[in-house]
Interface confidence: low
């Protein structure tokens, strides 16, 4: 019968020719009257056999990756009678791995969006590698993330390459982040192989800030012909946040004449000042007034951001006219 | 927008020292490192050494040790370079240049840079 | 000797394509990320090419990086007059502890 081990051999050798084991008959007493041969793809090119011993070579450098088995056929024949010693056999020669392939991160470019101020611990998104390498070898595939550029803001768990928060972020001082994330092969281990990647994370914002007047004191004048309904002049108050948590409403925080409103023109963010009752410079020429401006939406959660409302100072003063029939001599 | 501004050309006879500036702006210059690169006429670009200028740690090219001291001035966002013992071979134009938030990161801004000649 | 190896001159036409090579070791190219600067005759370096591959805003797609074991490459495709210049590889080296770079390659466009 037919006479062999399992047949291995490692990939990328760089030797001309790596010698892969040998196969004989148990019949072939080596006085050399037996010849073997190899059949089969890859048999002349790839692997080649010495006909006297049986003995297979590699001669060209194998790369797993592209190809991991080799399924070949023996045969022996007895050189003085032409027949065959043996049936005709196949057998397998498995190219072993070694760790010639970095990770690669697949699914890049990696973008996140992650609400601002979230706490340690929030879950940014999870980042694969995948290597080519034989997972079943060793730790050739074996991967483990690390953080190259993030620190002290996120942080990787090694072997899911998920990426959470480690420190809390405020938009409105950086609102996107840059993290590299690093996939190690061989569970890091002398030899490893990298890879990295990028991952873009961008704050979304969260209404953490209240809205507060430019100015603490604005001077307005109206003219005493005024009409009610007349726009005296407008207050504006910043708002770091953006979007809806940015709109704001302005109203009347003290009036005691009761002789002006405020409405809120929610394209520009202005506060417009409105003469809401005629007013008389010969009665009363100037009016102080305050007004106070609250963000339009504010969660519940949110509510200690917005516990004093900013409020600003108006004085108003109001403008004589000449009225008909008055001044005498 | 983030800008490094060197200081001036500067000649020195052999043996003297030389102190380049580079003022930094547009950024939180606390976060990021600054190395500098020197250039000779008509050669490649060379390393020297790396600050961190929150802390002022510094990194120096193993050529540059015991010559170079790099120093930083946080309250005008100016770093500086000193070389001593100049000799004829250090004539070269000389950058500072932006690092990332970590030592081994690249290199994103750079100054016009700074023409030294050393001449006896 | 620099210890990143990069070929001192490489040229092509108009609307070519080129590579440049960088060659390092385990200690740089193998452990970290290579970025490419581009000089233009009289000026700072650009950064060109940064974590191997990445591009910073306002440089053109023809330009791209390439990482393989311990070895990097820029690619220039639809090559330009304006792309004339010095380009050079650089790397941290976790052995030497510093920043190396390669001796940069003079990129001539062939009229």
């Known amino acids: 019968g037919w006479v062999w081990n399992q047949f291995f051999v490692p990939e990328e050798m760089n030797t001309t020719s790596h010698h892969v084991g040998r196969l004989r008959s148990d019949l072939d007493n080596g006085n050399n009257s037996f010849q073997y041969k190899l059949l089969g793809a890859g048999a002349g090119s790839t692997f080649i056999i010495d006909e006297r011993t049986g003995d297979i070579y590699a001669i060209e450098k194998l790369d797993r990756e592209e190809r991991s088995l080799y399924i070949l056929r023996a045969q022996v024949i007895d050189i003085t009678t032409g027949r065959a010693v043996e049936p005709e056999s196949e057998f397998v020669i498995k190219v072993s791995d070694i760790n010639d392939n970095e990770p690669k991160f697949l699914d890049e470019p990696y973008e996140a969006i992650v609400p601002e101020m979230s706490p340690e611990g929030t879950l940014v998104i999870q980042v694969t590698a995948s290597d080519a390498d034989d997972p079943s070898s060793g730790n050739n595939a074996r991967l483990l993330y690390s953080l190259l550029q993030g620190q002290p803001y996120f942080s990787v768990e090694p072997t899911t390459g998920v990426i959470r928060i480690s420190s809390k972020m405020d938009r409105e001082l950086q609102d996107e982040y840059w993290v590299i994330i690093q996939a190690k092969d061989m569970i890091g281990q002398p030899g490893a192989l990298s890879g990295t990647t990028s991952v873009l994370i961008k704050l979304s914002d969260v209404n953490d800030n209240k809205p507060i007047f430019k100015e603490s004191l604005y001077r307005l004048t109206v003219s005493e012909s005024a009409p009610t309904g007349t726009s005296i002049g407008t207050i504006m108050a910043y708002d770091n946040d953006i979007g809806e948590n940015a709109e704001m409403d302005y109203s009347i925080e003290e009036d005691d004449s009761q002789t002006f409103d405020i409405i809120t023109n929610h394209e520009t963010q202005e506060g417009i000042v409105i003469l809401k009752k005629k007013v008389n410079f010969e009665h009363q020429n100037h009016y102080g007034i305050r007004a106070k401006v609250k963000n339009h939406h504010v969660d519940e959660q949110l509510m200690k951001y917005h516990t004093e409302a900013s409020t600003t100072f108006i004085k108003i003063q109001v403008e004589d006219v000449d009225e008909p029939g008055g001044g005498g001599s | 927008q983030v800008q490094l501004v060197q200081s001036g050309a500067e000649v020195k006879k052999p043996g003297a020292s030389v102190k380049v500036s580079c003022k930094a702006s547009?950024?939180?210059?606390?976060?990021?490192?600054m190395s500098w690169v020197r250039q000779a006429p008509g050669q490649g670009l060379e390393w020297m050494g790396i600050i961190h200028p929150s802390g002022g740690d510094t990194t120096y090219a193993q050529k540059f040790q015991g010559r170079v001291t790099m120093t930083r001035d946080t309250s005008t966002s100016t770093v500086y370079m000193e070389l001593s013992s100049l000799r004829s071979e250090d004539t070269a134009v000389y950058y500072c240049?932006?690092?990332?938030?970590?030592?081994?990161?690249?290199?994103?801004?750079w100054g016009q840079g700074t023409l030294v000649t050393v001449s006896s | 000797q620099s210890v990143l190896t990069q070929p001192p001159s490489a040229s092509g036409t108009p609307g070519q394509r080129v590579t440049i090579s960088c060659s390092g070791s385990r200690s740089n190219i193998g452990s970290n990320f290579v970025n490419w600067y581009q000089q233009l005759p009289g000026t700072a370096p650009k950064l060109l090419i940064y974590t191997n591959n990445q591009r910073p805003s306002g440089v053109p797609d023809r330009f791209s990086g390439s990482k393989s074991g311990t070895s990097a490459s820029l690619a220039i495709s639809g090559l330009q007059s304006e792309d004339e210049a010095d380009y050079y590889c650089?790397?941290?080296?976790?052995?030497?502890?510093?920043?190396?770079f390669g001796g940069g390659t003079k990129l001539t466009v062939l009229s």
């Open positions: 650089a790397v941290y080296d976790e052995s030497l502890q510093g920043w190396v």
């Open positions: 240049a932006r690092g990332g938030i970590k030592l081994w990161l690249h290199f994103d801004y």
């Open positions: 547009g950024y939180t210059f606390t976060s990021y490192y």
